[in-house]
């Protein structure tokens, strides 16, 4: 907290320029009219002030307005935005797309700092959804956005802006994330071709049901080793050899060299041996010929 | 990306030194820099400033007419030429870069000293 001092004769700062940065702290809150500060905020990027300096300039605003700063003033508070902290940022109400590209472009190349998840939380309140020229923005500057909202944020996402969305978008998302995902995906983009629509749902197939995957055997996809690992377990379970011999195309005997790791361990698990050697891959695990195999939960929802 | 600072040492009454300001991981051109100090049990204070073209400069009072502020962007760097040093300058110095309007990144070296004695 800087002391209050009268500004010295002749020192009041008529404009924010880069004679500030010969003042002292004492100065710079004596000195520089808050209103001022507010009006020539885009001035304050091109002056080098130190840390402390900025930490006065921040301070005036604060006084000038305890409520929180308007939007004009926050799109050009550039490097100063790294001053505040998400208490701060919870009084903003920012609702313009440009402010916030603004203050995101002054974080790039960072992690997403508490400030800055402060501020995306603001602004999608602010619009009530995530639309889709908001996800542009947000996953342009963060690619793991989308995988940093809880499921219930999720769900505010229309399935338009699925369009928005890229595949490594989605590479730290968890099944949860991508069951509320994958719906969205499959009506943005269900006036696709079978080819087309494949490419582009293609990420979000961690959150397919079983009668989807059993839908896609029946189209040529041959979808690769890699997005098969990452459908969840239980709905690969119930698909038939056939059926995963006909999703996985020329892509099949991938299956050999994961056969320890789910969910093909465990699908491995369910299906016939004489079944399995149908491949012609040598997997192994697979029921023996001649068992019966009793649907356990079937019987208990008879009982 | 970061700024370096070299040129420092101890120094007379009266003598010279030259400091570097040089910019390692991207290009100074577009920065304006300003040159601070700060002596031991002081607040920092500003010494120089220098616009990102060159073509304005500025000085604090107390070193007016005695430093100078130069820039050299095909070396990357920019210098501050000290002359008649006082005791009184003394401390360490360090450079700041500002990237200016539509350009929020800001760079701060670690310093040098200098000892007048």
């Known amino acids: 907290e800087v002391e209050k001092t009268a500004c010295p004769s002749g020192k009041k700062a008529r404009e924010i320029d880069e004679s500030l940065i010969f003042y002292k702290k004492w100065e710079l809150e004596a000195c520089v009219d808050a209103a001022l500060l507010a009006t020539q905020m885009d001035r304050v990027n091109a002056i080098p002030f130190t840390y402390e300096q900025l930490d006065v300039l921040k301070h005036k605003l604060d006084e000038l307005y305890p409520q929180g700063y308007p939007e004009s003033v926050i799109q050009h508070l550039g490097y100063l935005f790294l001053k505040m902290s998400p208490e701060d940022i919870r009084k903003w109400n920012v609702t313009s797309l440009e402010t916030l590209k603004a203050l995101l472009e002054v974080n790039k190349g960072h992690e997403m700092s508490p400030q800055v998840a402060t501020l995306i939380d603001r602004f999608v309140k602010g619009r009530g959804q995530l639309d889709k020229d908001t996800l542009d923005t947000l996953t342009a500057f963060y690619p793991g956005y989308l995988c940093s909202l809880s499921p219930e944020e999720l769900s505010s996402v229309p399935p338009s802006s699925i369009w928005a969305v890229r595949p490594q978008d989605l590479d730290t998302c968890d099944p949860r994330q991508l069951d509320v995902l994958y719906p969205k995906a499959r009506l943005a983009f269900q006036n696709m071709n079978g080819s087309e629509y494949f490419v582009k749902i293609q990420s979000f197939l961690g959150g397919a049901p079983t009668e989807d995957l059993k839908a896609l055997s029946q189209q040529n996809v041959s979808m690769d080793l890699a997005t098969f690992m990452k459908l969840r377990t239980d709905a690969v379970l119930p698909l038939t050899v056939a059926e995963v011999q006909k999703l996985l195309g020329p892509h099949v005997e991938g299956l050999k060299a994961e056969e320890r790791h789910r969910p093909v361990r465990d699908w491995i698990l369910r299906q016939r041996q004489d079944d399995l050697d149908t491949l012609g891959l040598g997997l192994q695990g697979g029921i023996p010929n001649g068992y019966l195999v009793l649907d356990l939960s079937m019987q208990e929802a008879l009982s | 990306l970061q700024l370096v600072e070299s040129g420092g040492g101890l120094v007379q009454p009266g003598g010279s030194l030259r400091l570097s300001c040089a910019a390692s991981?991207?290009?100074?051109?577009?920065?304006?820099i300003g040159w601070f100090r700060q002596a031991p049990g002081k607040e920092r204070e500003g010494v120089s400033y220098i616009s990102s073209s060159g073509g304005s400069t500025n000085y604090a009072d107390s070193v007016k007419g005695r430093f100078t502020i130069s820039r050299d962007n095909a070396k990357n760097t920019v210098y501050l030429q000290m002359n008649s040093l006082k005791p009184e300058d003394t401390g360490v110095y360090s450079c700041v870069a500002a990237g200016g309007y539509g350009n929020s990144s800001r760079y701060w070296g670690q310093g040098t000293s200098v000892t007048v004695s």
């Open positions: 991981g991207f290009t100074l051109d577009y920065y304006a």
